[in-house]
Interface confidence: medium
């Protein structure tokens, strides 16, 4: 059962796992949600009736029954983890805490003009978890405007005290706002030296990498595969750090793999969602329950529905025993990972999918695409929307992409002559334009935000946001696409598609069925050669075949250039302009979305 509200002057008795310090009850609830075992918590607010050493304590709790006895206590605020809820969860915390000093290891001290600059510095520093900034009103002259970057083993403060004229806050890495470079490659036959901060068991290097990404102190990792010569170290995932944030040495070793935390581009990768099954693999851990199940998929469902289950092992039925049902062992551990991994015993293992909602919704796998053909099928491009104008009569105006539950990203040039958002309608989950009738539900547009440097499509800044009047409930047919990460400049996209209801040739009409075309990206240098009369800037990206034949066209404007990388779709471009349609040696020109991530986040995350 999902309980979101906080219980004032209430304390949960017993069930303590650990105590951390958080600046608010709201953040305590987030910490509890991200902790592998926490189901409930009690937070102590500052209060004259409470011992100041207990202020800001956040006690994380667990219970077999998923609840604990309640006791009245002034200044105590209790609640439940969001693990029991089905809604999206984010670790992003932009709050600034006034007159609070969050204690940790002060490893960097510098002068900053404002708390915002200090927070940006923390976000762009690989080690920084949170910061404290002494304002210009701070009593001690030599400490005024000092920005202290801090880290701890847990990522949360070791203590929080009241201190006048300072402000504190957290790194915004989990808000996708970091400039730190993302190295996505996993390096085979490589061991990274440097100090281990923790070790866990993992079935493969990908799970090891995801564990590293959400571990507060992990910057890179080394994973020993099941073929590693030393038996005791097989399936061991070593979480590592170094002063520079990078490995000091790479050692060539067979059967080991190494890689990096993807903390600064975690909004566009699955971090908590380990959806694979591991065949002939047994996960060991504390047993929660043993239930009969028809298949390993059914076993995973049982684990996902049991709030305390973290992973499972399924042993298929022997011949005709038990109506063909096998045994499903639901398990847990202190850190959410198996305590040991064994191979060759015939089990099928995997993880709960309950934590998938802690990843960005845009990382969810969508149904496999239909290869060949140009017409799309339902649910193939669930982020694609059709934007209609109702003036003078209703018609398709442009494409667009869902990037958040209240936000559509599209092209600025679509709004030439549009006087008011009132005449706009956004339809999502649509395959055929003919589905749109008088009574078809749509989203009204509350606000059109056009980039303030936009003049015309050909000169760039062809980007706009639509804020919807109501929120989109995500389903298989309408869900967001991930934005590319700022730190992700090394990704080379090879699987890119342009979609829309636009013309199929220059003189044509809007298509009924959503069309798709696979199109290769073209370097800006090559693109510039094809458009001598224009300036192809780094804020544009081009795509097209040299011989032409496939391209976006009139009516596709504002729609997505979607590229798949590591099973996740990214909104790489927005259909903007081109010379004719699908002409030989005339690639389509798209708005290069990665160059506008800051602008998008600034507009969509404005308080």
């Amino acid at each position: 059962e999902c309980v979101t509200q906080l219980l004032k002057d209430t304390c949960f008795e017993g069930g303590d796992i650990t105590t951390v310090f958080t600046p608010s009850a709201k953040y305590c609830q987030v910490v509890c949600t991200y902790h592998p075992r926490c189901l409930l918590f009690t937070f102590t607010a500052e209060s004259p009736s409470e011992d100041p050493t207990r202020w800001f304590t956040c006690v994380l709790k667990d219970s077999v029954t998923e609840t604990l006895p309640r006791v009245n206590r002034t200044a105590a605020i209790s609640g439940y983890s969001f693990k029991q809820c089905s809604h999206q969860i984010s670790a992003c915390n932009k709050d600034i805490y006034v007159d609070l000093d969050m204690k940790g290891i002060n490893y960097n001290s510098s002068v900053a003009k404002s708390a915002q600059e200090c927070q940006e510095r923390c976000t762009d520093d690989v080690h920084c978890h949170f910061f404290t900034y002494a304002t210009r009103q701070f009593p001690s002259l030599e400490h005024r405007n000092i920005c202290l970057l801090k880290h701890t083993q847990t990522g949360t403060p070791t203590r929080i005290t009241k201190l006048d004229k300072v402000v504190s806050g957290f790194s915004l890495k989990s808000c996708a706002l970091s400039n730190l470079a993302c190295i996505r490659d996993i390096f085979p036959n490589t061991v990274f030296a440097d100090s281990n901060i923790d070790s866990v068991m993992a079935p493969d290097a990908f799970v090891c990498g995801r564990i590293c990404t959400h571990h507060p102190g992990c910057l890179f990792f080394t994973f020993f595969s099941q073929e590693w010569p030393k038996e005791s170290q097989r399936n061991l995932c070593l979480l590592k750090t170094s002063e520079s944030g990078l490995p000091s040495t790479r050692i060539k070793k067979s059967k080991a793999l190494s890689g990096f935390s993807l903390q600064s581009c975690r909004h566009s990768i699955p971090v908590f969602c380990h959806s694979s099954f591991y065949h002939d693999t047994d996960f060991l851990g504390e047993e929660l329950d043993i239930v009969a199940a028809k298949s390993h998929e059914a076993c995973q469902k049982l684990c996902t529905n049991a709030v305390r289950c973290q992973f499972f092992t399924y042993t298929p039925a022997q011949a005709s025993c038990n109506e063909g049902k096998g045994k499903c062992y639901l398990k847990l551990s202190s850190n959410g990972s198996p305590t040991k991994i064994l191979h060759g015993r015939g089990g099928i293992s995997g993880y709960t999918l309950r934590l998938c909602k802690m990843d960005n919704e845009c990382t969810t796998k969508i149904k496999p695409r239909i290869v060949g053909g140009t017409a799309s099928v339902r649910g193939e491009w669930p982020w694609q929307v059709t934007l209609h104008t109702t003036s003078p009569t209703q018609r398709h105006l442009c494409g667009g992409s869902i990037i958040g539950n209240q936000w559509i990203l599209t092209a600025a040039h679509c709004f030439y002559g549009v006087e008011s958002p009132k005449i706009l309608r956004v339809y999502s989950g649509i395959l055929n334009q003919s589905e749109i009738k008088e009574d078809t539900s749509f989203f009204g547009v509350q606000e059109i935000i056009i980039h303030d440097q936009y003049k015309m499509a050909e000169s760039g800044y062809d980007i706009a946001l639509l804020k919807l009047e109501t929120t989109v409930n995500y389903t298989d047919s309408q869900r967001p696409i991930c934005l590319p990460s700022k730190g992700d400049r090394n990704v080379i996209y090879t699987d890119c598609w342009v979609t829309g209801w636009g013309y199929r040739k220059l003189r044509d009409k809007i298509q009924n069925t959503l069309q798709k075309a696979k199109i290769p990206l073209v370097t800006n240098e090559e693109c510039q050669k094809r458009y001598r009369g224009h300036k192809i800037t780094h804020k544009m990206i081009c795509a097209g075949y040299r011989e032409g034949g496939k391209d976006a066209c009139k009516g596709d404007s504002g729609g997505p250039l979607s590229c798949k990388h590591n099973e996740v779709w990214h909104l790489v471009g927005i259909t903007s302009w081109g010379e004719g349609c699908a002409q030989r040696e005339r690639p389509g020109v798209y708005t290069n979305v990665v160059e506008y991530v800051d602008w998008i986040l600034e507009k969509t995350q404005a308080v």
Epitope: D125, V126, E243, S244, G245, R489
Partner: nanobody, 122 residues
């Protein structure tokens, strides 16, 4: 203390090549990363390429991928930027920077050279 001195800038025609060098001296082994940044007239600082000093990881910004190559000669304590197929929009003052973070943010670099001007024009 670390000192960085760039050289190799100059005037070059579109399509031409240049090789920038950055000689580092002082306490350089404390630096986790080195980078080339550039500042075009009237624009802000833009990251061009990064290199991790010990492990050699490299990253390029989109607009220079396939044209520029960053490298480092540890024995000479020198960082290089080989620039091919130069375009007018590459015109800028190029700065070499050293710091402890592998980052695109200029604020992550504590040490900077004085800059070398690259002009691409016919």
């Amino acid at each position: 203390q670390v000192q960085l001195v760039e050289s190799g800038g100059g005037l070059v025609q579109p399509g031409g090549s240049l090789r920038l060098s950055c000689a580092a001296s002082g306490y350089t082994y404390s630096m986790g990363a080195m980078a080339w940044f550039r500042q075009a007239p009237g624009k802000g600082l833009e990251g061009v390429s990064l290199i991790a000093t010990s492990s050699g990881f490299i990253s390029y910004t989109d607009s220079v991928k396939g044209r520029f190559t960053i490298s480092r000669d540890n024995s000479k304590n020198t960082l290089y930027l080989q620039m091919n197929s130069l375009r007018a929009e590459d015109t800028a003052v190029y700065y070499c920077a050293a710091g402890t973070q592998f980052s695109w943010s200029p604020g992550s670099y504590n040490y900077w050279g004085q800059g070398t001007l690259v002009t691409v024009s016919s």
